[in-house]
């Protein structure tokens, strides 16, 4: 026997309290399969959360961040603040890389400049709070009275950072 | 959409070595750190340490620094785990997961069993 | 490193509040975040960054932190609440993260 429920479209709920009659889906609410015994609750884009696409009757709406902020999860289920380049997000806030560490992106965390010295190369770039250094060739492989531009980086072991 | 997805279950030997996978898709695999967090039988959840792919830099767990290797090769866009000598104790579930602070996506998780 | 210790075992009764506490030297300078893992299944992140709830996780759950203590709160638990919860914070000394050694909560 087939089951009455399984004639109501995406968009409609079988009814229950009205003899299994393929009901709507009230407002703020949607079904996104047939067959369903309940509309499921719209989920609402609010605070850090802003609507990207509004809930239908047969699709729920869909969320991303506010400016200044990404987005993390499944959906889009989180939202946490962007810093700028050159620095990482503590509870105090978004906090400049201390020295000898970079961050190239608006999210995460510093992270030590790579040590040239370790590949047997020397610093071709200097590193700076927002960049990696640029290792280029070894000593060695510099012309006679040559040298790098800089002292090696630091090794590549995380220092002290700000809270 | 992102997923993280682990290599299969491993039955071992103390002793042997062991690399195990998590493949990341869905996103920039290279711009967000990859944790690896243990979880030994009836247990709870330990964090071992990180990659930053883009790099391959890693940060360690004290508890974990010597004991395990985590390394990464962006261009498959895949995490490693390894063991150069495995021992009785490294019996656990292993799970892989995005972030460094959050951990927002895992992996369905590697039953490593060490056994003689 | 920061230790985080939490009780191993909370029970409640359907549709009473559960406090699940997360212990740790000045974690409040830090942020909190609670996962819930259900046997056999990775754990998922019910609160995030002290307070803030990701979509999808019901209303009941919420959370604070502040001083040596982080608290999750289940208000109205659920049967299917039942499950062990994580706390973890990211030390910025050391740059590692921590788990608390867990909470398995019953509902009773």
């Known amino acids: 026997l087939q089951d009455p429920c399984s004639k109501c479209p995406a968009g409609t709920f079988c009814d229950n309290n009205r003899n299994q009659i393929c009901s709507p889906c009230p407002p703020n609410s949607f079904s996104s399969t047939s067959g369903q015994k309940a509309c499921d609750i719209c989920r609402q884009c609010e605070g850090v959360f802003r609507t990207k696409k509004v809930c239908s009757s047969t699709s729920n709406a869909e969320c991303d961040c506010t400016p200044g902020f990404h987005c993390l999860g499944a959906g889009c289920s989180m939202c946490e603040q962007d810093c700028k380049q050159g620095q990482e997000l503590t509870k105090k806030g978004c906090k400049d890389c201390c020295f000898g560490t970079f961050n190239d992106q608006k999210r995460g965390i510093c992270r030590p400049w790579t040590n040239c010295s370790l590949d047997g190369k020397s610093v071709l770039v200097n590193g700076t709070k927002e960049r990696d250094v640029v290792c280029g060739p070894s000593p060695a492989d510099l012309s006679p009275g040559a040298s790098s531009v800089t002292p090696p980086a630091p090794a590549r072991e995380p220092g002290h950072s700000p809270q | 959409q992102v997923q993280l997805v682990q290599s299969g279950a491993e039955v071992k030997k103390p002793g042997e070595s062991l690399k195990i996978s998590c493949k990341g898709s869905?996103?920039?695999?290279?711009?967000?750190?990859i944790s690896w967090v243990r979880q030994m039988p009836g247990k709870g959840l330990e964090w071992m340490g990180k990659?930053?792919?883009?790099?391959?830099?890693?940060n360690y767990s004290p508890s974990f620094q010597g004991q395990v290797t985590i390394s990464a090769d962006k261009s498959i866009s895949t995490a490693y785990l390894q063991w150069s000598s495995l021992k009785a104790s490294d019996t656990a579930m292993y799970y892989c997961?995005?972030?460094?602070?959050?951990?927002?996506?895992w992996g369905q998780g590697t039953l490593v069993t060490v056994s003689s | 490193d920061i230790e985080l210790t939490q009780p191993p075992s909370v029970s409640v009764a359907p549709g009473q509040t559960a406090r699940i506490s997360c212990s740790g030297d000045?974690?409040?300078?830090?942020?909190a975040h609670w996962y819930q893992q259900k046997p056999g299944q990775a754990p998922v992140v019910v609160i995030y960054?002290?307070?803030n709830r990701p979509s999808g996780i019901p209303e009941r759950f919420s959370g604070s932190n502040s001083g040596n203590t982080a608290t999750l709160t289940i208000s109205g638990t659920q049967a299917e609440d039942e499950a062990d919860y994580y706390c973890?914070?990211?030390?910025?000394?050391?740059?590692?993260?921590?788990f608390g050694g867990g909470t398995k909560l019953t509902v009773l």
């Open positions: 997961a995005r972030g460094y602070g959050i951990f927002d996506y």
């Open positions: 869905g996103y920039s695999f290279s711009t967000y750190w």
């Open positions: 990659i930053y792919p883009g790099d391959s830099y890693t």
């Open positions: 000045n974690i409040g300078d830090q942020y």
């Open positions: 960054q002290d307070k």
């Open positions: 973890s914070t990211y030390t910025f000394v050391g740059f590692t993260t921590v």
